[in-house]
Every structure is written in structure tokens, then in C-alpha cells.
Interface confidence: low
């Protein structure tokens, strides 16, 4: 049978031939009548066998990590017969490893983001290094890590590739640090192969900053025109944080917010000072705020570091403006009675400059022909008023400044015209009636009411009566029914159309006003036949008759 | 921007010791090596030391062993270099640069340097 | 004698580039970083390339840093009259502990 060791060869061997060991057959006796032969890949070309004694030999340099086994065949023959002496048999060639590969990084480049201040022992990230070489065989391919770069800050645990931070780190001094990672193998042992990585550690922001104001004093100035809700100008804090921790918000303190109010521009991140109340210079033309700063996001493990607020003090100079003139009140109300003479007196409105210069004031009343106004503001009728044609006027009053006419107020003027009684009471409407010829005593025959143009305080109350002439020879008479109406009654039995076919009776009416007026108002009165069972049938006004709808034969 | 300045020039006797300072500014004194290089009249640059500030832990060439002392003092944020028993082949340009071994695998800052000149 | 091998010259004119070599062993650039310094004319060094192949900002483009095994390049390209300077190659060296500096090349723009 067939007769040989385990066969290895070592890697990288320089020789130009290096013998591995011998293949024999125990039949062989040392003659030299057996012939060997090397069969499969690399037979001839990488291993070469003595064909007499069977000694193999590796004539090119090997790479373990390219091929770390062979497989070939062996046969043995005998020369005189040329037979196999023994069956064809496989065997093996190990290339046994030397420490020829380096530890390699192969998952670079590494980056790694921690939070600034985070404490000694935290993970920041693990490298791993793979090394080439045999893992079974001696410490080839065992590694232990080093730190090349990055003291004192980071740490590397020796087996495992794992950084720690070692010391904390601020993010405002530094952001980020390129640690150097050393991977040696045969455990750091001499001769061991030693590779490197970069490591990018970024630290992340955490919010240990708070907002501080750039200036200790912003001076800003706002017009008195300015209407509310102006930006006057901007103030801003600086916060060594990024990001969303940087985001802070502006206010003012509260005593000092009535007239100014700050909103935060979260793009800018400054503080917009806003006019909240419009601002007078003649009232105050200065003001002086305290605004403050904070983070408009703040853990509650890092509020230690925002314990007090960053504040400025803002002074606000208010700039004058050359105003309008300003009436005492926003309209005038005035009364006049009517019929009160050209000339008479009104009212007075005044307006005074705002301004520090106190410009003297010119008034005049726009679209009117019934009243005038002097430079004192005093008001008087130009025209004769009439309240049952006018009981009102809407007006507008404009003050202009003397030394700036563009500079005008309008305000709006109303005049009520009071009454007086200058109108008597008439009918209200005309009053035209008949009576039948046999008409009895007492009858009414007519019931009459009367208006008056004017305007009464109290209710408007109205006295009936006949004129002196009718009361003393009149055929009819009157009764007031004590509520502005009164009726005419006959005042005798009987009526001759043919003697005296109409009446025309005369009726005083008074007012109640002080002093009363009376007018005189005349009532006609036909006389009719109007047959026995009162129908009428003629009068001598035709018309009259027809007008009234009554029947004629 | 870093600045590291450096002492004025010294001319010494031979046998005699030279101290030159480094003053550093604008950043953390503390987490930087500072190494040491000089460089004589037309020749290269050669390599004397390093110390770290903060525990004064030091390293030097072996050419320098015994002849040179680096200190560093926290306080002002300075950094010292004393050579001993001068020769006149100690004439030389000296510079501080901040890095060196371990924290920083270069020398990103270099000092103005100090010329000194040894002469009997 | 330098433990890192520089040629003590180099030249090239405007426009070209140039390449200056550092050789060095195992223990040094074999195991380390290589890292390039510019020495202007009465001036300190100031650092050029470091971790091989990285540039510090402000430094142009047109120079780029390389290593292969035990020797590293540095590369100029678009040569400038403002690069005449000498040029240093340095690296730790685990041997020796310490620091070491290549002899240093003049670089002369014609």
C-alpha cells in the first residue's frame, strides 16, 4: 500500500525549490524499478515529483490566501512491466500560513455623530478589521485594536473595535475629530502587521448654550404715523448651538409691553420690534424696553444651562410728525331755532394743532350757503331758517394749518333747527257737506280735524269754535271733542233750499303753542230736498250730490 | 486662527543652555501635543520631541536624549524647550508645531520660529 | 543621512507638473502615515498634505499626495512660480519612536 505523511507546505517561500515530503509504495524496495507520477491541477507546474523516490518539491513561491489546498493523484508503476503497483491514490497539500497579510478596514470610510458632553463609556461606533490570513493558525489573524489618533478624547476596547467617548467633548469648540484606529494582529505581538482607519466622529448638538444678545442696547426710532402692527427694526441674539437648539424666541418683559411687542423671525432667527399702540411725539417721544431671549426648545436635563435669560434694553425715539389738526370732539351737534335772524349764533367748534409748534387753525364749512364760521370756529346763520323745510343739516367742518394747508381734519357738523310756532292749525283736508231741508235740530252733519306744520313738544292740541259772526246768527253750531276733532250740528229744525240753498260757516281752529295762532277755516254747507224718507233727491249743486254718490231722480 | 509665538532670537556660548517658549492662543491649549523641530542654517528639518501640555508627558529623539527638556505650563498657555550643553552644530532655526505622535499624525500649526546661535 | 529618501532637486516650468518622491522602510512609511510640508523662503513649514492623501483647506487642488508600500509621491500640477519652495515628506517611524523628516527637495520653477 501506499505510504505517506500529512504533506504542508509554507506560503511565500523564496526557494526556487522546497521538498514538501515522499509518496512511496511499500512494495518498494529501493531498486529503482518503480516509476512515480503526479497527476492533477498543478502537477508539473507548481509541485514536481521525483519519479524514482517519489519526493515531491514545490518549485513556485505560494499564496495561502489565493489556494490554501491542493488536491493530486499519485500513481507508482513498475518499469519492467509497466503495471500500476498500487491503485491510484488521491492526496492533499495544506499551504500552512505565515503572517504575511495586513488587518484590512473594509467597511471605510467609518463616520460616527455622538452628542457633544455625552459621558465617559458612551458607544460612538465599532470598526472591524479582517485580516487574511489563517484564523487557526497561531495568532495570524488575531488583532487587537489601538487608538493612534484621538486621545484624550476617545478609546478603543482592544478586542473588539468598539470607541468610547473617554472625555467629554463640546461641540462650540470643536465638532468633529478624525480618530486613527490601529488594528495589529498576532494580538500586537513582534512581527505582527499593523493597518489603520480614519474614523469621522461628528458631535451632534445639544442645546448647553443659551441665547445671548449682540449688543447690550439697540436704539431704534418709529415714526408717530407709524400704524400698529410697523416693524420699527430688529434686534438679535447669537447662540453657539445649531439647529433646532439655536431657535430661540424674543418677548418683552412685562411691565414694558403695552406699546411694543417683539415676534421672533424663526428664518432669521431675530426679533422683529413691533409698534402695538400708536405712538404721539407730543405725548412721549421716548421709551425704553427690556426685551429677553430664550431657546425655544429646551430639555428639561439641560435647563440648568438657560437658568437666566439673556436681556437688552431697547430705547425707542419717537420721531415727530407734522399732523392734521385735531377737532376737541370727533362731530359737533348744534341747535338754532328756526326763523332766527342772518347772523345769529350757532356754536363753536375748535381744533388745535397737535404739533409743538401749535400752527394757528382756519375753519371753513364745506357746501353751505345757510351758515358761516369765522377763524375763531364760532358758527352763524348766513340765511333765515325754516324748519318745516329743513329740520336738519349734515355738514362737514374742515381746520386747515395756516403754516401747512395739506395739513386738514374734516369732522362732521349736524344742526338741528328747533321749532317755533309759526304755523296755525287748518282742516286737513277741504270739507264740503249738504243738509236735508227737514233736517231736525241737533243733527251732526259733518265731524272736521285739523293739522298743524309745526312740530310740538307735547302733543299737538287743537281748539274748535265758530266765528263770532256764525255763533251769534248761525244755523248750525259746534262741539270740540276735546281730541283734535270737532262736529257741526244743525242748530235749528228745518231748511229752505230756495231762500238759502248754502251755508258757509266759518270755524276757528287754535293751536296750544306759546303763543297760540288761530286760522279761520270756512265750511260749505248745501241744502238739499231729500224726500221723506231722507234720500236725497236735489240740491241745487248738482255736482255736489253726484260727487257724494247720492241718488238723483 | 491658531497662533503659537514664539520667544526671540538667542545667541549663547558653547556648554551653555538655551530656553525658548511657545505661547499658544485661540484654541484648547490642553488637548494638543506640541512637538519641537529645528532646522540648522541650509539643511533640513529634524525632529527634537513632544510633549502633551496637560500631563507633560514627553517623548524625545533619541539624538536629544538628556540634553533636552520640554515643560509646559497651563497657566499661560506656554510651552518650553531647553537644550544643554550647547555645540556650535546647535546653531538653528528652532520651531514649535502643534501634533505629533498619537492626538495628531501631522504638525498643523507651526511657530514663527527662533534662531539660535551658538558661538564662542 | 535622512532616514526618508527625497531628491534633493527638482524643476519643472509653469503649467507642468511635477513629482517629488519619499522613500522609506517597513517601520515608517510601510506602517504609517506620510504626511508633506512647504518651506517657503524665510518662512516656517506649513503643512501641505497629511494622512497621505489629504489636503488641509486653502491648500489648491493642483497638489495631491500618494503612498504605495514603503515610498509616497507628492504631486504638483499647473506648476506656479508660487510654488518654489522646498519640500518636506515626513512619517513616525516605529523603530526609531519618533519622528522622521525626508532631506528635503528645492523645487525650482523655471
Known amino acids: 500500500g501506499w505510504v505517506w505523511n500529512q504533506f504542508f507546505v509554507p506560503e511565500e517561500m523564496n526557494t526556487t525549490s522546497h521538498h514538501i515530503g515522499q509518496l512511496r509504495s511499500d512494495l518498494d524496495n529501493g531498486n529503482n524499478s518503480f516509476q512515480y507520477k503526479l497527476l492533477g491541477a498543478g502537477a508539473g507546474s507548481t509541485f514536481i515529483i521525483d519519479e524514482r523516490t517519489g519526493d515531491i518539491y514545490a518549485i513556485q513561491k505560494l499564496d495561502r490566501e489565493e489556494r490554501s489546498l491542493y488536491i493530486l493523484r499519485a500513481q507508482v508503476i513498475d518499469i519492467a512491466t509497466g503495471r500500476a503497483v498500487e491503485p491510484e491514490s488521491e492526496f492533499v497539500i495544506k499551504v500552512s500560513d505565515i503572517n504575511d497579510n495586513e488587518p484590512k478596514f473594509l467597511d471605510e470610510p467609518y463616520e460616527a455623530i455622538v452628542p457633544e458632553m455625552s459621558p465617559e463609556g458612551t458607544l460612538v461606533i465599532q470598526v472591524t478589521a479582517s485580516d487574511a490570513d489563517d484564523p487557526s493558525s497561531g495568532n495570524n489573524a488575531r488583532l487587537l485594536y489601538s487608538l493612534l489618533q484621538g486621545q484624550p478624547y476617545f478609546s478603543v476596547e482592544p478586542t473588539t473595535g468598539v470607541i468610547r467617548i473617554s472625555s467629554k467633548m463640546d461641540r462650540e469648540l470643536q465638532d468633529e475629530y478624525w480618530v486613527i484606529i490601529q488594528a495589529k494582529d498576532m494580538i500586537g505581538q513582534p512581527g505582527a502587521l499593523s493597518g489603520t482607519t480614519s474614523v469621522l466622529i461628528k458631535l451632534s448638538d445639544v442645546n448647553d448654550n443659551k441665547p445671548i444678545f449682540k449688543e447690550s442696547l439697540y436704539r431704534l426710532t418709529v415714526s408717530e404715523s407709524a400704524p400698529t402692527g410697523t416693524s420699527i427694526g430688529t434686534i438679535m441674539a447669537y447662540d453657539n448651538d445649531i439647529g433646532e437648539n439655536a431657535e430661540m424666541d424674543y418677548s418683552i418683559e412685562e411691565d414694558d409691553s403695552q406699546t411694543f411687542d417683539i415676534i421672533t423671525n424663526h428664518e432669521t432667527q431675530e426679533g422683529i420690534v413691533i409698534l402695538k399702540k400708536k405712538v404721539d411725539f407730543e405725548h412721549q417721544n421716548h421709551y425704553g424696553i427690556r426685551a429677553k431671549v430664550k431657546n425655544h426648545h429646551v430639555p428639561e436635563q439641560l435647563m440648568k444651562y438657560h437658568t437666566e435669560a439673556s436681556t437688552t434694553f431697547i430705547k425707542i425715539q419717537v420721531e415727530d410728525v407734522d399732523e392734521p389738526p385735531l377737532f376737541l370732539l370727533p362731530y359737533y351737534v348744534f341747535e338754532v331755532f328756526e326763523e332766527t335772524p342772518q347772523g345769529s349764533f350757532v356754536g363753536v367748534v375748535s381744533a388745535t394743532d397737535p404739533d409743538n409748534r401749535k400752527s394757528p387753525i382756519r375753519y371753513s364749512i364745506t357746501r353751505s350757503k345757510v351758515f358761516n364760521i369765522n377763524d375763531n370756529g364760532t358758527i352763524t346763520t348766513s340765511n333765515s331758517l325754516d324748519r318745516e323745510i329743513s329740520a336738519w343739516y349734515n355738514l362737514s367742518i374742515t381746520a386747515t394749518e395756516k403754516y401747512n394747508i395739506e395739513q386738514i381734519s374734516s369732522i362732521p357738523l349736524y344742526v338741528q333747527v328747533l321749532n317755533i310756532n309759526d304755523h296755525a292749525p287748518e282742516f286737513s283736508q277741504y270739507y264740503e257737506t249738504y243738509v236735508c231741508e227737514n233736517a231736525g235740530s241737533g243733527q251732526v252733519i259733518q265731524t272736521i280735524s285739523a293739522v298743524d306744520r309745526d312740530e310740538s313738544i307735547e302733543e299737538h292740541h287743537f281748539y274748535f269754535n265758530l266765528s263770532v259772526e256764525d255763533t251769534n246768527n248761525s244755523s248750525f253750531t259746534i262741539i270740540d271733542n276735546q281730541d283734535n276733532t270737532a262736529v257741526i250740528l244743525t242748530n235749528r229744525t228745518g231748511f229752505n233750499l230756495q231762500e238759502e240753498p248754502v251755508f258757509y260757516i266759518s270755524i276757528l281752529i287754535a293751536d296750544n303753542g306759546i303763543p297760540s295762532l288761530t286760522s279761520t277755516n270756512t265750511l260749505t254747507i248745501h241744502v238739499c230736498d231729500c224726500g221723506d224718507s231722507g234720500s236725497t233727491q236735489t240740491c241745487q249743486y248738482q255736482e255736489l250730490v253726484l260727487s257724494m254718490g247720492f241718488k238723483t231722480e | 486662527q491658531v497662533q503659537l509665538v514664539q520667544s526671540g532670537a538667542e545667541v549663547k556660548k558653547p556648554g551653555a543652555s538655551v530656553k525658548v517658549s511657545c505661547k499658544a492662543s485661540?484654541?484648547?491649549?490642553?488637548?494638543?501635543?506640541m512637538s519641537w523641530v529645528r532646522q540648522a542654517p541650509g539643511q533640513g528639518l529634524e525632529w527634537m520631541g513632544i510633549i502633551h501640555p496637560s500631563g507633560g508627558d514627553t517623548t524625545y529623539a533619541q539624538k536629544f536624549q538628556g540634553r533636552v527638556t520640554m515643560t509646559g505650563d497651563t497657566s499661560t498657555s506656554t510651552v518650553y524647550m531647553e537644550l544643554s550643553s550647547l555645540r556650535s552644530e546647535d546653531t538653528a532655526v528652532y520651531y514649535c508645531?502643534?501634533?505629533?505622535?498619537?492626538?495628531?499624525?501631522?504638525?498643523?500649526?507651526w511657530g514663527q520660529g527662533t534662531l539660535v546661535t551658538v558661538s564662542s | 543621512q535622512s532616514v526618508l529618501t527625497q531628491p534633493p532637486s527638482a524643476s519643472g516650468t509653469p503649467g507642468q507638473r511635477v513629482t517629488i518622491s519619499c522613500s522609506g522602510s517597513r517601520s515608517n512609511i510601510g506602517s504609517n502615515f506620510v504626511n508633506w510640508y512647504q518651506q517657503l523662503p524665510g518662512t516656517a513649514p506649513k503643512l501641505l498634505i497629511y494622512?497621505?492623501?489629504q489636503r488641509p483647506s486653502g491648500v489648491p487642488d493642483r497638489f495631491s499626495g500618494s503612498k504605495s508600500g514603503t515610498s509616497a509621491s507628492l504631486a504638483i500640477s499647473g506648476l506656479q512660480s508660487e510654488d518654489e519652495a522646498d519640500y518636506y515628506c515626513a512619517v513616525w517611524d516605529d523603530s526609531l519612536n519618533g519622528w522622521v523628516f525626508g532631506g528635503g527637495t528645492k523645487l525650482t520653477v523655471l
Open positions: 508645531a502643534r501634533g505629533g505622535i498619537k492626538l495628531w499624525l501631522h504638525f498643523d500649526y
Open positions: 494622512t497621505n492623501n
Open positions: 485661540r484654541y484648547t491649549f490642553t488637548s494638543y501635543y
